[in-house]
């Protein structure tokens, strides 16, 4: 039969940042197509990316329904042009993905410093509350909405003239730090979820320095 050339998908990998979640796999198809199914541990299978020649499938819409659930996906392989055909056991070939729990495993996206304001020897640094694709009551939730106090930010700040980075932490999106009068400082933030065992930290935000446009200085 024509199924003998169909190969099972392998290296199924979840790629997820701020809940935007894509399943990737190999190999690039030769005379075959793929369909993906996703399910929670207790739920029914839902098919996505029907008969595709891609080696990735965006499953964001499914996982954002409940980011605390654990999901399993599987990738079915079919002969191109003969998708009704099945393998020798009467089933199309398929491979299971690793389990994936978005709340625990999605990578934290690179944060952005929204603004900073100096008032005397205090600086208030505000982190942008990034929007996710998780919805509640028809509105998109921010990262803070989803993670609450589980999400903290670490601020690295240093004098423009030196390299040593002091740190501050917040479980809101604002920092208030003490600085030396007359010194210019640079800032970078990192998102952290301390309760996690993997993917605990984000990459650092772009560096912002005093004396640039984002900041405001007020002498008291």
């Amino acid at each position: 039969s024509g199924t003998t050339n169909t190969v099972a998908a392998y290296n199924l990998t979840w790629k997820s940042t701020n809940f935007k979640t894509i399943l990737e796999w190999e190999p690039k198809p030769v005379n075959q197509v793929y369909t993906v199914q996703i399910s929670t541990k207790s739920g029914d299978w839902k098919s996505k990316c029907f008969y595709t020649t891609d080696t990735e499938c965006d499953l964001t819409d499914e996982i954002v329904k409940d980011v605390k659930q654990t999901y399993l996906a599987r990738v079915f392989s079919y002969p191109a042009g003969n998708v009704e055909s099945t393998g020798s056991a009467g089933e199309p070939l398929y491979e299971n993905s690793p389990e994936f729990t978005p709340y625990l495993e999605t990578n934290l996206g690179q944060p952005t410093i929204q603004s900073f304001e100096q008032v005397g020897t205090k600086v208030n640094v505000t982190v942008e509350d990034e929007r996710t694709l998780v919805r509640r009551n028809n509105t998109f939730l921010s990262l803070r909405d989803v993670f609450g106090k589980d999400l903290i930010y670490t601020l690295y700040y240093w004098k423009s003239s030196s390299s040593g980075k002091k740190t501050a932490k917040t479980n809101t999106n604002e920092f208030l730090i003490d600085v030396d009068k007359g010194e210019n400082y640079c800032f970078s933030v990192q998102a952290v979820i301390p309760s996690r065992t993997v993917n605990r930290k984000s990459t650092d935000s772009p560096v912002e320095c005093m004396g640039q446009e984002k900041g405001e200085f007020r002498e008291i």
Partner: antibody, heavy 121, light 107 residues
Framework: EVQLVESGGGLVQPGGSLRLSCAAS????????IHWVRQAPGKGLEWVGY????????YYADSVKGRFTISADTPKNTAYLQMNSLRAEDTAVYYC??????????????WGQGTLVTVSS | DIQMTQSPSSLSASVGDRVTITCRAS??????VAWYQQKPGKAPKLLIY???FLYSGVPSRFSGSRSGTDFTLTISSLQPEDFATYYC?????????FGQGTKVEIK
């Protein structure tokens, strides 16, 4: 099991150099922060510096700034303390410690066994 | 830098005694204070974090509290294995700083 093991201590002459290692097992250092702390004989604990192995950020105590450098090799899951221009007052047991957060409060939950550095002619 | 002033520097007590060690921060440190126990020739061990949270595996006779910038470590009933040196530490700002230590000795 989480473990930190320091090595590299020993006797060195004033002005000399030494590199201490802090090998971690049971966790990935890039997910945490590593601090170095020292304790001179019969004295209290003195913070030396930290590194965030994920991004390389460091900060040092004034007493060692410009002489000591902290680095990390994440594939080897090891942090290092490079000590140059050593002085007699740097004689101490050196510890590395893992820092984690509870909410926004930091705590140092695992410490190495310590390695003795003696600076003497 | 924030100073952590610890008192007393040493104390003598008997098994079963209630022991209190205090630390005063030179400025507000919120709850960012931890307490460590150290025995001779050993590394410090975490007892209390976030001013009042008992670290996993630490006996419940240890407790921590905060009143403004004053922090207290209490051992409700001193046991033979509790004779050691205790340090407070703040990590509200960089650099983190330790108290000078309190040596708890057998009376």
């Amino acid at each position: 099991e989480v473990q930190l093991v320091e090595s590299g201590g020993g006797l060195v002459q004033p002005g000399g150099s030494l590199r201490l290692s802090c090998a971690a097992s049971g966790f990935t250092i890039s997910g945490y922060w590593i601090h170095w702390v020292r304790q001179a004989p019969g004295k209290g604990l003195e913070w030396v510096g930290y590194i965030d192995p994920y991004n390389g950020a460091t900060y040092y105590a004034d007493s060692v700034k410009g002489r000591f450098t902290i680095s990390a090799d994440t594939p080897k899951n090891t942090a290092y303390l490079q000590m140059n221009s050593l002085r007699a007052e740097d004689t101490a047991v050196y510890y590395c410690a893992r820092a984690d957060y509870h909410g926004v409060d930091e705590y140092w939950d695992y410490w190495g066994q310590g390695t003795l550095v003696t600076v003497s002619s | 830098d924030i100073q952590m002033t610890q008192s007393p520097s040493s104390l003598s007590a008997s098994v079963g005694d209630r022991v209190t060690i205090t630390c005063r921060a030179s400025q507000d440190v919120n709850t960012a204070v931890a307490w460590y126990q150290q025995k001779p020739g050993k590394a410090p061990k975490l007892l209390i974090y976030s001013a009042s949270f008992l670290y996993s595996g630490v006996p419940s006779r240890f407790s921590g509290s905060r009143s403004g910038t004053d922090f207290t470590l209490t051992i409700s009933s001193l046991q033979p294995e509790d004779f050691a040196t205790y340090y407070c530490q703040q990590h509200y700002t960089t650099p983190p700083t330790f108290g000078q230590g309190t040596k708890v000795e057998i009376k």
